[in-house]
Amino acid sequence: QRLPRMQEDSPLGGGSSGEDDPLGEEDLPSEEDSPREEDPPGEEDLPGEEDLPGEEDLPEVKPKSEEEGSLKLEDLPTVEAPGDPQEPQNNAHRDKEGDDQSHWRYGGDPPWPRVSPACAGRFQSPVDIRPQLAAFCPALRPLELLGFQLPPLPELRLRNNGHSVQLTLPPGLEMALGPGREYRALQLHLHWGAAGRPGSEHTVEGHRFPAEIHVVHLSTAFARVDEALGRPGGLAVLAAFLEEGPEENSAYEQLLSRLEEIAEEGSETQVPGLDISALLPSDFSRYFQYEGSLTTPPCAQGVIWTVFNQTVMLSAKQLHTLSDTLWGPGDSRLQLNFRATQPLNGRVIEASFPAGVDSSPRAAEPVQLNSCLAAGD
């Protein structure tokens, strides 16, 4: 059953996209560690910065202003129902001017904790996934996605925000991590490397994949992203690794074929609606899950990460298009836009399947050391 949308009162004009651009800023966030093609194994024990206490002092998020009295919601699904507003429902968006959060980049200054103190928190993302250390958790049921099949109209905004390519999703895409753990999708974006250099954010046994997709969701318990930031389970990200395969991926081609139009930083285009679920692996039952953070400033913690065991295949040409088309700040290519893996600091990654026995994207010895924290839920 679809979750009903908020209908009464005035449209909520704020809080927006998520992980790559959670505050709806023109440009969000920088990295304290330069992204590396390959993080050394065991890096999870070596934080990139000193571990400062958590992320309590998050920057305030201001609602976006509305244009011409119209609905200009960034990515929030809780929009006014048709009839009340002065115009039809719409997901045409205007970014507000960048503020303190917007001056960051991958590699070099300023250090991310200076951009947002939460970036020095203890429970950050991404992490290295070691399947044999994951706790098998039978309570983790197959993910449920509803409304991810979109007709061609209305079109969706595809934007080069200088840090990634981001597709803003319309309201109505619902995802459940389990009973009572319901979310609405806000946006998706990608992370990649460069020619011959992989660029996924998460790694498996130290292995970095060519690229990674993130679909960012807001818990239905919150009306706006700024309310959810830093709250446990307030945001959830579905992540999948992209690998090279022999055939062109037709779902991804609908986006990749449009990248030339948004080569310049800050540029955007409109693309026909598509089956968003086709961008993800088909097996929704086998995944890893842990609590982490946004992988870009403000690096807010409490984010539930779900990393699919199954990968998505793109052709070599498609992966090349992804890593070699867009431009970022300062006339530099938009490449290697991934954060170094962060220490687990005692966190246990859960698996919805016996990963240590049967092995994940990268096989390991069949050992299961950790027990499922959610057992009996």
Epitope: S70, G147, P154, G172, Q270
Partner: antibody
Framework: QVQLVQSGGGLVQPGGSLRLSCAAS????????MSWVRQAPGKGLEWVSA????????YYADSVKGRFTISRDNSKNTLYLQMNSLRAEDTAVYYC???????????WGQGTLVTVSS | QSVLTQPPSVSGAPGQRVTISCTGS?????????VHWYQQLPGTAPKLLIY???NRPSGVPDRFSGSKSGTSASLAITGLQAEDEADYYC???????????FGGGTKLAVL
């Protein structure tokens, strides 16, 4: 408030042409995809054509493909349907409508009658 | 023949509950596309009644509700009133036809 005011309907002979207009007001026209839907006398609704907000993408029902052309002039806040090679079966009330976020047709024009007859 | 199948007519007495079904296939409703419902009062343009399967635009009474399951959807009207007498249409998108599709319409008579 949102208003869609249609014009251009009338009587035309088979094989003839007609251009329908839909003048929009009360919202940022260029931000919204638009559609044409028709209803033959005593019959149900039939989707005819659709166009994206920028006008860059257009879609047609098989029954009108190659004969009808949807277009828009965002500077004039107006949607058009150019109908060529008209047939008797094109006789209908034509409605313009706006697409909302969910793909529903949220607002409709008042309709304009097109009669194709000799 | 419409891609989405609706009963040609339904009827009910004032205060009663009626449902209107809308049956599609694996390329439209069954593929996961949203279903929307429209009400067309005699001599007027259609009006959006239910969007995205079960959501009511503001101004639409809560007597109207929608649901969707598998390859079909339904519209329920409770506490039937004389002013509900109208034609009702379901609509979705069909990926095989690459077209937006409507049901044939259902005429509701309030007895």
């Amino acid at each position: 408030q949102v208003q869609l005011v249609q014009s251009g309907g009338g009587l035309v002979q088979p094989g003839g042409s007609l251009r329908l207009s839909c003048a929009a007001s009360g919202f940022t026209f260029s931000s919204y995809a638009m559609s044409w839907v028709r209803q033959a006398p005593g019959k149900g609704l039939e989707w005819v054509s659709a166009i994206s907000g920028s006008g860059g993408s257009t879609y047609y029902a098989d029954s009108v493909k190659g004969r009808f052309t949807i277009s828009r002039d965002n500077s004039k806040n107006t949607l058009y349907l150019q109908m060529n090679s008209l047939r008797a079966e094109d006789t209908a009330v034509y409605y313009c409508a706006t697409y909302g976020d969910y793909g529903s047709l949220d607002y409709w024009g008042q309709g304009t009658l097109v009669t194709v007859s000799s | 023949q419409s891609v989405l199948t609706q009963p040609p007519s339904v009827s009910g007495a004032p205060g009663q509950r009626v449902t209107i079904s809308c049956t599609g296939s694996s390329s439209n409703i069954g593929a996961g596309y949203d279903v929307h419902w429209y009400q067309q009062l005699p001599g007027t343009a259609p009006k959006l009644l239910i969007y995205a399967n079960n959501n009511r635009p503001s101004g639409v009474p809560d007597r109207f509700s929608g649901s969707k399951s598998g390859t079909s959807a339904s519209l329920a009207i409770t506490g039937l009133q004389a002013e509900d007498e109208a034609d009702y249409y379901c609509q979705s998108y069909d990926s095989s036809l690459r077209a937006w599709v409507f049901g044939g319409g259902t005429k509701l008579a309030v007895l």
